[in-house]
């Protein structure tokens, strides 16, 4: 492409940055940007705090968190002071009727009697056929099975107590969790007399018990963590060291590593081409054609026709060709990308504190999520609890005259009903009163608050890191010119001047994300609808919004870098970043892909390394480590391995996100540097010598021959 043509393209995306003699990296004298948005954000946060206070004043999360018996009395309080645990007579009815929405709104409520108990049942037990005619006292009270509802007479027949659901028909060994007795052991329960296989209890017992192993799985897991937590921490430490090591060693091995990786990709594609050719050849000789197959929704059937392999071969061949052409014609761009990666590695080495900034982001994100969760919980429980009449078997004799779902007083249970098992149970929270009527709107406000604050925290992290790394790039004499506390000064600067700009960027992203959530919700509701046009439109919408979100994230990221450097408002920064990148689009694409490839490999290395080490250690395959390094005896050795792998992935992601931000910042600075400076004495390049060398440029030496330190 000719130089003139390139100039025309560049003009379309604005003029190159002019030289500014006062520019010395991130501007010191700044003013607040996007003040309106800052005020709006602060007002929103203030409103969010007010919502939180209102929720705290009106809500009672005890209603969700603390267990309550069928009468609505809290376990472990008042009359139930010595009975802190809640026992569900038939916990399987909870399993069958519980979903995330009902739990969020109503807590762990189940359509089964619930009683406060001093301790959870320890042994499996079922009412025997011969016990139905005995008294409650004989079957329950004398056997220390004090699990009936309060006030059940000693001399009541067991069968009638079961019909009225005053006593449980079976007990499972349970362990208290969240103040509730949850079954934990696999036991072979005797058959429940009179209960056919298609009843809830029989289904529930067989279903749940079959899914539980010989001993309490949760206890086994807990034991495994108790035995291996130290070694899991060691594995995470290894992941941390490997991530750091990888980033710091990039300055030495970035070139060969990128080359090896690209050649590796080429090799994999070449093997793919070979494999597809072999498959195609075999099927072509057999004469297996798609015309014989016809149309089928069975995708695996397409593996046995030659056209499938031919199509795959063509796609892989095209990819291979593109990659080869890129390697041949864009090698200069690849060399620049490698040099920038090395520079980023140096920057991280100079400012190690940046590697641990993700911890700050993590804590702030945790605060945002916790605040939202607590507010949502308090809001959900801000109404007066409402109770309605409910019976497990409304077809029982005597139930036909009972108005099921009419409101009732839980303290005045229908103990003398003609309908067996009639109870006054918790239904939900009333919507009377201003707060309760506005509940939905307040929850929406909370969700908006969650998204906006989360995105703002992430934006803050990006802007702070950009400020720190920009101060590294624009330090003429490295490391002397780098500020003493680059990260802290960037943090203070960002918070002080650019809260509004970050809020603006975060709000744009939030609106797109909310739109995506709404679309997902609509899609979920339309799952049953088989209209292909509707499905197609929905799919297109979702795809468009996904692309839009990706683009906005990319734009925001670069806008924040510009904000960190120049201190301009969001729109100006986003425009400048976008035009600068568009003027250098080929470099952008190459750097982006090379960085992605490298960071993907880095993650693979860290996660794979930790995974392999964990596997060999926890499965006891490493011999002769000595007593101090002996692997613990575990029930499930894969558990600490998976934990280590997931932890390693989180750690690697945290470190590499910093490194990615560093690369992006240095790249933008590099592009600015190229446009702003020309290597003359009054306009020297700030980039490293290796970058200058690749570009075939150099800085003029000062008359006193004092060389610039790099």
């Amino acid at each position: 492409m000719g130089g003139k043509q390139r100039d025309k393209d560049d003009e379309a995306y604005g003029k190159p940055v002019k030289y500014d003699p006062s520019f010395r990296g991130p501007i010191k004298n700044r003013s607040c940007t996007d003040v309106i948005c800052c005020v709006l954000f602060l007002l929103f946060i203030l409103g969010y705090i007010v919502v939180g206070i209102v929720a705290w004043l009106y809500g009672d999360p005890r209603q969700v968190l603390y267990p309550r018996n069928s009468t609505g009395a809290y376990c472990g309080m008042g009359e139930n002071k010595d009975k802190p645990y809640l026992l569900y007579f038939n916990i399987f009815s909870c399993i069958l009727s519980t979903n995330i929405i009902s739990v969020a709104e109503n807590g762990l409520q189940c359509p089964t009697p619930q009683v406060c108990v001093s301790s959870c049942p320890e042994d499996p037990w079922t009412v025997g056929k011969n016990q139905f005619s005995q008294t409650v006292g004989e079957v329950f009270y004398t056997k220390n099975r004090n699990f009936c509802l309060p006030g059940v007479p000693w001399n009541m027949m067991v069968i009638t107590s079961l019909q009225q659901e005053l006593c449980p028909s079976f007990l499972l060994p349970s362990a208290p969790a969240l103040g509730r007795c949850f079954p934990w052991t696999n036991v072979t329960l005797p058959e429940l007399p009179g209960i056919t296989n298609d009843t809830t209890i029989a289904q529930g017992i067989s279903g749940l018990i079959d899914s539980l192993n010989a001993r309490d799985i949760s206890v086994k897991i807990f034991e495994d963590f108790a035995h291996s937590w130290y070694w899991i921490l060691v594995a995470l430490g290894v992941a941390l060291l490997l991530s750091l090591l990888f980033i710091l060693l990039l300055r030495l091995v970035a070139g060969p590593l990128v080359l090896v990786l690209i050649l590796g990709v080429l090799g994999v594609l070449a093997y793919g081409i070979y494999y597809c050719w072999e498959e195609y050849r075999v099927l072509r000789d057999k004469g297996a054609s798609i015309s014989q197959l016809g149309f089928t929704t069975n995708l695996s059937a397409y593996q046995s026709v030659q056209e499938t392999w031919l199509a795959a071969l063509i796609v892989l061949a095209v990819l291979e060709a593109i990659l080869l052409l890129v390697l041949i014609f864009l090698r200069q761009r690849i060399r620049i990308a490698i040099a920038l990666l090395k520079e980023a590695s140096k920057a991280v080495g100079q400012m190690m504190s940046t590697m641990f900034y993700p911890l700050v982001t993590f804590v702030l994100l945790l605060i945002c999520i916790a605040y939202w969760a607590m507010t949502a919980l308090y809001l959900a429980t801000s109404g007066q609890p409402q109770y309605v009449l409910w019976a497990s078997n409304i077809s029982s004799p005597g139930c036909e005259k009972v108005s099921i779902n009419t409101s009732c007083n839980p303290m005045d249970q229908p103990v003398n009903s003609s309908c067996p098992g009639l109870m006054c149970v918790f239904q939900g929270y009333s919507s009377k009163g201003l707060v309760q009527r506005s509940l939905f709107n307040l929850q929406i406000y909370g969700v908006l608050g969650l998204f906006w604050t989360l995105n703002w925290v992430l934006a803050l992290g990006q802007c702070v890191l950009a400020g720190a790394f920009a101060s590294f790039y624009w330090a003429f004499h490295k490391p002397q010119d780098i500020p003493t506390f680059p990260l802290i000064s960037a943090f203070i600067r960002t918070l002080r001047y650019h809260t509004g700009s970050l809020a603006f960027g975060a709000l744009i992203l939030t609106l797109v994300q909310i739109a995506r959530v709404i679309l997902e919700y609509i899609d979920h509701k339309l799952r049953g609808v088989q209209n292909p046009v509707a499905r197609c439109i929905m799919c297109c919408f979702k795809c468009c919004l996904w692309c839009l979100e990706k683009f906005i994230k990319f734009l925001n990221r670069n806008a924040y870098i510009m904000i960190a450097i120049y201190g301009k408002n969001f729109c100006v920064s986003a425009k400048n970043a976008f035009t600068l990148l568009m003027r250098n689009i080929v470099r952008v694409v190459v750097l982006d892909k090379v960085t992605d490839l490298l960071l993907f490999f880095g993650k693979l290395l860290v996660v794979g390394g930790v995974g392999v080490l964990s596997f060999f250690f926890f499965s006891g395959r490493i011999q002769g480590l000595g007593r101090d390094f002996k692997s613990p005896h575990l029930n499930y050795y894969w558990l600490p391995i998976m934990t280590s792998i997931m932890g390693a992935y989180v750690i690697a992601s945290g470190f590499f996100s910093v490194f990615g931000m560093c690369v992006d910042t240095l790249f933008l600075c590099f592009l600015e540097d190229l446009e702003r400076n020309d290597g003359s004495l009054d306009r020297p390049y700030y980039m490293s010598k290796s970058l200058l060398k690749i570009l075939g440029k150099k800085n003029e030496a000062p008359p006193d021959n004092k060389k610039r330190k790099k």
């Epitope: 027949m157 429940l192 007399p193």
Partner: antibody, heavy 125, light 107 residues
């Protein structure tokens, strides 16, 4: 058809014993609970005792506890009431009655459904 | 023990009358209440179980209602064969107990 026939009644002196029998027919005796109910002359009905289908569970009214014993022989389809230390207030017509609960139906309990014609016990010196 | 009381203890009615007998338990017995009919010199006959369900062969003129502690037996149209003594019985708490009975005779 379902039938219950009581026997063994008669005149007996206070402090003596008597054994009442109830022969069942027309149903699977071993699957049902059985009751004894009495009625003193000119008075109302009084529940005396129950024995459940397998004979394992027996319950009595307080006034006869320790003196009367309810039992059954499922092989002979017969229900018994052994009455010891009889008192004048035990004078009554004794009825046996079948309980509708068979031990198989978990969800419903109906109480007594079929009655015998009764046998008279007179305790007199 | 649970005490069962019936009211009235006796009543006089004419053929075709609607008769209502009430039974009260000293504590809640849910719906575990039965009604029996006994004619002089005869064995009792089961009419109603579970407070309101009719035994097989019992005419629909008999109906029962109530739960907890208060129950009623209603004969919608009294016939000559219905003149007898009626007993209620609770069968949920041992010992099972009968009411004292309500005698229905011809006016």
């Amino acid at each position: 058809q379902v039938q219950l026939v009581e026997s063994g009644g008669g005149v007996v002196q206070p402090g003596r014993s008597l054994r009442l029998s109830c022969a069942a027919s027309g149903f699977t005796f071993s699957s049902y609970g059985m009751h004894w109910v009495r009625q003193a002359p000119g008075k109302g009905l009084e529940w005396v005792a129950v024995i459940w289908y397998d004979g394992s569970n027996k319950y009595y009214t307080d006034s006869v506890k320790g003196r009367f014993t309810i039992s059954r022989d499922n092989s002979k389809n017969t229900l018994y009431l052994q009455m010891n230390s009889l008192r004048a207030e035990d004078t009554a017509v004794y009825y046996c009655a079948r309980d509708r609960y068979s031990g198989y139906d978990y969800f419903y309990y109906y109480g007594m459904d079929v009655w015998g014609q009764g046998t008279t016990v007179t305790v007199s010196s | 023990d649970i005490q069962m009381t019936q009211s009235p203890s006796s009543l006089s009615a004419s053929v075709g009358d609607r008769v209502t007998i009430t039974c009260r338990a000293s504590q809640g017995i849910y719906n575990y209440l039965a009604w029996f009919q006994q004619k002089p010199g005869k064995a009792p006959r089961s009419l109603i179980y579970a407070a309101s369900s009719l035994h097989s062969g019992v005419p629909s003129k008999f109906s029962g209602s109530g739960s907890g502690t208060d129950f009623t037996l209603t004969i919608s149209s009294l016939q000559p064969e219905d003149f007898a003594t009626y007993y209620c019985q609770q069968y949920t708490i041992y010992p099972f107990t009968f009411g004292p009975g309500t005698k229905v005779d011809i006016k």
